[in-house]
Structures are given as structure tokens and as C-alpha cells.
């Protein structure tokens, strides 16, 4: 167990041109507050996915009113640290989201209005017990400077807060086989209390005899890497060779969600859906009121005037969750055309178009026949994001601008000789053959294989092909 601590140093305009307008004005004074969301691992997760390591809200900052004509300075910040307690081992790698929120204090109907000013995100490696790490992140024209650290809560120590320490029983040294607990040299590492054989790298325990696994490991001793790719079900066949999750208790067995929360399994762990008034990984945090601003993404908080009465977040369209923290997946309706990739930015949908298409929904075919002319009597044919010209006889090329050699394909059969002609081609047939392409043999008695020769043409005459 331990605490992740975040200290915001400044929030203001970033360097370079295009300074942002002050978020507050004389007519509409406001104050800032911050929200931090932590997730284990280095996965590039969506902003709406659960804050599995925890989340925290800061206090409100001082009220700020813009001075007319003055550039937007660094804005006044809330006092104190943002603290996110974690109950289990510190994962060592984590993803964070830090949101800067504005609370407008004008004459709002139904109380103050909240809006998201900036959101920064990142992925970091961090050992518990280390020094403060400093960071600068930019969101649009805004810049956020902050520091963070993870520290273990006694009796836990170590880079993952999984080793336990106890006060020394003897004044001078620790017991046999037990090391001093750096940096608490006056304490000793507690005797090993985990289940026998529990992996020291991938397992930990908080109670004697248990073996709890770090993310990515499973099995009674946390020695089996999780890989569900070849499994038949989320807890598929038990096999040391496949590396599938071992059958047994699922993450929701025994319902880890407190305060009436309901548990649902996720590919990596579990997720608690908390009743109103509770939040946190296991719905363990309570006592939230509307004054704490629990509703995100512009949600309207109703009720919850005191910690004993539950609040309700009325979410704006497109957001959901008991705190309006999750976005509805609008891209599942596939609004982008022609194979475009859908991106839900919250305030709008965007489509990333395939080559050959453009427009807000990739609805414009850049290579279609609109405005395309095929020369020399050719006709345009559309298809598959490209266009081609079907050229009139005697012409070729992409736009039918090139004069074609009608004899290039050797169209005259049986040794006939081809002559280009203004209206196409003419075949001079070898003796014994006739037809536009010299394709018909002439029978010895003078009759041809044709029912009848066209009037005015004798076998052996050059045939003009129109």
C-alpha cells in the first residue's frame, strides 16, 4: 500500500505564439481545480477507461478575475497535493491523465458550471520511494508544470511497496536472515509471510499465507504469465504450455466492490460500478458532495448537499457513468464512409480518410469523374476511388489524349497485313482468308465459311474494319 502524490507547480500559457485567452473575465470570475487519473501499465488507454490505480480531485483554487488588457498569466492554483492512495503493489509503470477544470462563478442557473480547460496524458516508469520527478506537459496553448512521486505507507517498503517492515526487536541488529529496511534503518524487514513458493518477482501478500499477483501474472504462486490469446474463454484451459489463465476464482468472485458496488470482469481485471456517493477502484471512497465537483464532462450535480446524502450526476449527451466520466462510443455506428477511420474527440467526431477520399465523413471521392474530361470522345468510368477513361477507337492513354496504333496488337489473323486507317484499321488478308480480321478461311470451291460475303467484296479483298 502507498500513496501517489502530485504537486501542480503552474498552469498557464505555453511558450510561443498564440497565447490562449484567459479562462476567466471580470464578468465571469472563475477558479481552477485539477483531477488526476492513474492506470497501471504503459497501455495507451482511452481517457474514459477506468482509473484502475485510483483518481483524485484537488481543492478549488483562489477565485481569479482577468485584468482587462493584461496577458493571461499563470493562473492561481489550489493549495496542497493531489493524493491517490493505492492499496496493492505499486506497478512501477503507469499511465496518467491530468485534467484542468474551470469552475465559473457567475450567476449560473443551478449552481456553478464546470468545463474542461486542458487534458494532458503520459506514460511513465516510477519506483516507489524515489525522489520527486518533475514534468512539463502541453495541451494546446496551455502548459502544465508538475512533480510527482509514489511513496509507501508503513509498514510497506521497496520499489513496489511489497516488502513489509517492523520495528526492531533488538536495539542493535535484525533477526537472522532479515535485512535492515532502507531507508528506515531502525526497522527490519518483516519475516516472509506470503504463501510458500509465492513468486518474489510477480507476487506479493498483505496477509500471512496469501499470494496475490502483480498485473500480467496468474496462478496460485503467480508464476504463470497471462496470455489469453490462445484461450477458449477469459479463464481458459489450464496449461503451462499455453500460458492461459488458470481456471479458478474469477476477479469478481466474492465481489471486491464495497458499498453495494456491482462487479464486472474486464480482460485485465475487474471494474466496479459504484452506487451514487461512492467511487474509487472498489467503491471504497465516500463522503463526496456536489461541492466536490464529482461530475465530469459538464455533468450537472444534483442533491448531495452533505456527505450523508447521495448526489446524482445528470450527464450531457454522449457521456455516462455515475460521474459522467465515460464517453459513449459513437464510432460504433461507423459514421465514416469509404473505409475512413473514426475518432471520437468528445466535442466532435473526426474521420481519417483513406487515400482518394476527403470530406468530414470521407464522402468525397477525389478521383471520381466529376470535372474529369476524357478527350477524343472517350467516356469516364468510376470505380474504387479511381477513374479511368474508356477511349474511342484509335485513342488511348489515361485521358484518351494519345493516338493509339490500332495495328500494335496484331489484329489480323492468318498472316494478314494491318494498315492503320483514319477510321480504324484495315486488314489485307493472305490468300485463302477473308473477313474483317482475316479470320475466315475461303473454301477451295470459292465459297467461304461465311453465310455470304458482303456485297461488293470479293474474297482476298482488303477488309475495312469500322
Amino acid at each position: 500500500a502507498g500513496v501517489f502524490e502530485l504537486q501542480i507547480h503552474s498552469f498557464g500559457p505555453g511558450p510561443g505564439p498564440g497565447a490562449p485567452r484567459s479562462p476567466c473575465s471580470a464578468r465571469l470570475p472563475c477558479r481552477l481545480f485539477f483531477r488526476v487519473c492513474l492506470k497501471p501499465g504503459l497501455s495507451e488507454e482511452a481517457a474514459e477507461s477506468p482509473c484502475a490505480l485510483g483518481a483524485a480531485l484537488s481543492a478549488r483554487g483562489p477565485v481569479y478575475t482577468e485584468q482587462p488588457g493584461a496577458p493571461a498569466p499563470d493562473l492561481p492554483l489550489p493549495d496542497g497535493l493531489l493524493q491517490v492512495p493505492f492499496r496493492d503493489a505499486w506497478p512501477g509503470t503507469f499511465s496518467f491523465i491530468i485534467e484542468t477544470w474551470r469552475e465559473e462563478l457567475g450567476d449560473q442557473i443551478g449552481g456553478p458550471a464546470w468545463s474542461l480547460l486542458a487534458r494532458v496524458a503520459g506514460r511513465r516508469r516510477l519506483a516507489a520511494g524515489g525522489p520527486w520527478a518533475r514534468d512539463i506537459q502541453r495541451a494546446g496553448a496551455w502548459e502544465l508544470r508538475f512533480s510527482y512521486r509514489a511513496r509507501c505507507e508503513p509498514p510497506a517498503v521497496g520499489t513496489a511497496c511489497t516488502r513489509l517492515c517492523r520495528p526492531r526487536s533488538a536495539p542493535s541488529r535484525c533477526g537472522p536472515g532479515l535485512r535492515p529496511c532502507a531507508p528506515l534503518e531502525d526497522e527490519c524487514e518483516a519475516p516472509l509471510v506470503c504463501r510458500a513458493g509465492c513468486s518474489p518477482e510477480h507476487g506479493f501478500c498483505e496477509q500471512p499465507g496469501e499470494c496475490r499477483c502483480l498485473e500480467g501474472w496468474t496462478g496460485p504462486l503467480c508464476t504463470v504469465p497471462v496470455s489469453t490469446s490462445s484461450c477458449l474463454s477469459p479463464r481458459g484451459p489450464s496449461s503451462a504450455t499455453t500460458g492461459c489463465l488458470v481456471p479458478g476464482p474469477g476477479p469478481c468472485d466474492g465481489n471486491p466492490c464495497a458499498n453495494g458496488g456491482s462487479c464486472s470482469e474486464t480482460p485485465r481485471s475487474f471494474e466496479c460500478t459504484c452506487p451514487r456517493g461512492f467511487y474509487g477502484l472498489r467503491c471504497e471512497v465516500s463522503g463526496v458532495t456536489c461541492a466536490d465537483g464529482p461530475c465530469f464532462n459538464g455533468g450537472l450535480c444534483v442533491g448531495g448537499a452533505d456527505p450523508d446524502s447521495a448526489y446524482i450526476c445528470h450527464c450531457p449527451p454522449g457521456f455516462q457513468g455515475s460521474n459522467c466520466e465515460k464517453r459513449v462510443d459513437r464510432c460504433s455506428l461507423q459514421p465514416c464512409r469509404n473505409g475512413g477511420l473514426c475518432l471520437d474527440l468528445g466535442h466532435a467526431l473526426r474521420c481519417r480518410c483513406r487515400a482518394g477520399f476527403a470530406g468530414p465523413r470521407c464522402e468525397h471521392d477525389l478521383d471520381d469523374c466529376a470535372g474529369r474530361a476524357c478527350a477524343n470522345g472517350g467516356t469516364c468510368v468510376e470505380g474504387g476511388g479511381a477513374h479511368r477513361c474508356s477511349c474511342a477507337l484509335g485513342f488511348g492513354g489515361r485521358d484518351c489524349r494519345e493516338r493509339a496504333d490500332p495495328c500494335a496488337a496484331r489484329p489480323c489473323a492468318h498472316g494478314g497485313r494491318c494498315y492503320a486507317h483514319f477510321s480504324g484499321l484495315v486488314c489485307a488478308c493472305a490468300p485463302g482468308y477473308m473477313g474483317a480480321r482475316c479470320e475466315f478461311p475461303v473454301h477451295p470451291d470459292g465459297a467461304s465459311a461465311l453465310p455470304a460475303a458482303p456485297p461488293g467484296l470479293r474474297p482476298g479483298d482488303p477488309q475495312r474494319y469500322l
Epitope: P317, L333, Q334, P335, R337, N338, L349, R361, C362, E363
Partner: nanobody, 119 residues
Framework: EVQLVESGGGEVQPGGSLRLSCAAS????????IGWYRQAPGKQRDMVAG???????TYAESVKGRFTISRDNAKNTVYLQMSSLRAEDTAVYYC?????????????WGQGTLVTVKP
């Protein structure tokens, strides 16, 4: 501004059928994509069925073979025929549409209609 108005919800027994309607109204708009989402108590709002931007029908795995989406372009109305209903289909069903107004696209939600499946 485009309004989406759902109707046809109600209570039905397992195995029964319902037909939901969603009528779009407004001025000078064209529908790019339109469909149905549903949200059960305490759950996420998920897409059930829809007509994509390419006017192809798409369905959630859990309703394939049981639900059918159709539309009447002349009436700017989309329908969801639900059959072989199960208890887990109980939810508020929302109509959603990606709509072109002028040169811009906007997303609209209806108010929702409740479908309850219970013996």
C-alpha cells in the same frame, strides 16, 4: 437543430416482440448514420444496430439474428424490430444520428424509450 423522437417501448414477456420507431425532424438536414443504442441500469450505453455512413447495416453480436433495423427515407424514420426478447434486453433504447446540417455534421440523441422484458 434536429429532434429524434423514439416510440414503441413497453413491457413484454421473454420470447416476445416489439417494434421501436425513431422519427427525425428538423429543417434542412440529411442523415449520414443513424441507429439504436441501449443502456441497462448501471451499465454502459452500447450500440445495438444501425445504418452506417455507407448505409450498411451493423448489429451488436448479442442481437444478431433477433433484431432487424430498417428505415423509411421518405419519413426520415428508422425502425428496430426486436424478436425473441430476453431479460438481458431490458434497457432504455436511444435513437442516435450523425446528421449533416449545412456543411457541418452534428450528433443527436433521442430521449429514449424503455423496454422491459420480464415473465
Amino acid at each position: 437543430e434536429v429532434q429524434l423522437v423514439e416510440s414503441g417501448g413497453g413491457e413484454v414477456q421473454p420470447g416476445g416482440s416489439l417494434r421501436l420507431s425513431c422519427a427525425a425532424s428538423g429543417s434542412d438536414f440529411s442523415i449520414n448514420a443513424i441507429g439504436w443504442y441501449r443502456q441497462a441500469p448501471g451499465k454502459q450505453r452500447d450500440m445495438v444496430a444501425g445504418f452506417t455512413g455507407d448505409t450498411v447495416t451493423t448489429y451488436a453480436e448479442s442481437v444478431k439474428g433477433r433484431f432487424t433495423i430498417s428505415r423509411d427515407n421518405a419519413k426520415n424514420t428508422v425502425y428496430l424490430q426486436m424478436s425473441s426478447l430476453r431479460a438481458e434486453d431490458t434497457a432504455v433504447y436511444y435513437c442516435a444520428a450523425d446528421v449533416k446540417i449545412g456543411g457541418d455534421y452534428e450528433w443527436f440523441w433521442g430521449q429514449g424509450t424503455l423496454v422491459t422484458v420480464k415473465p
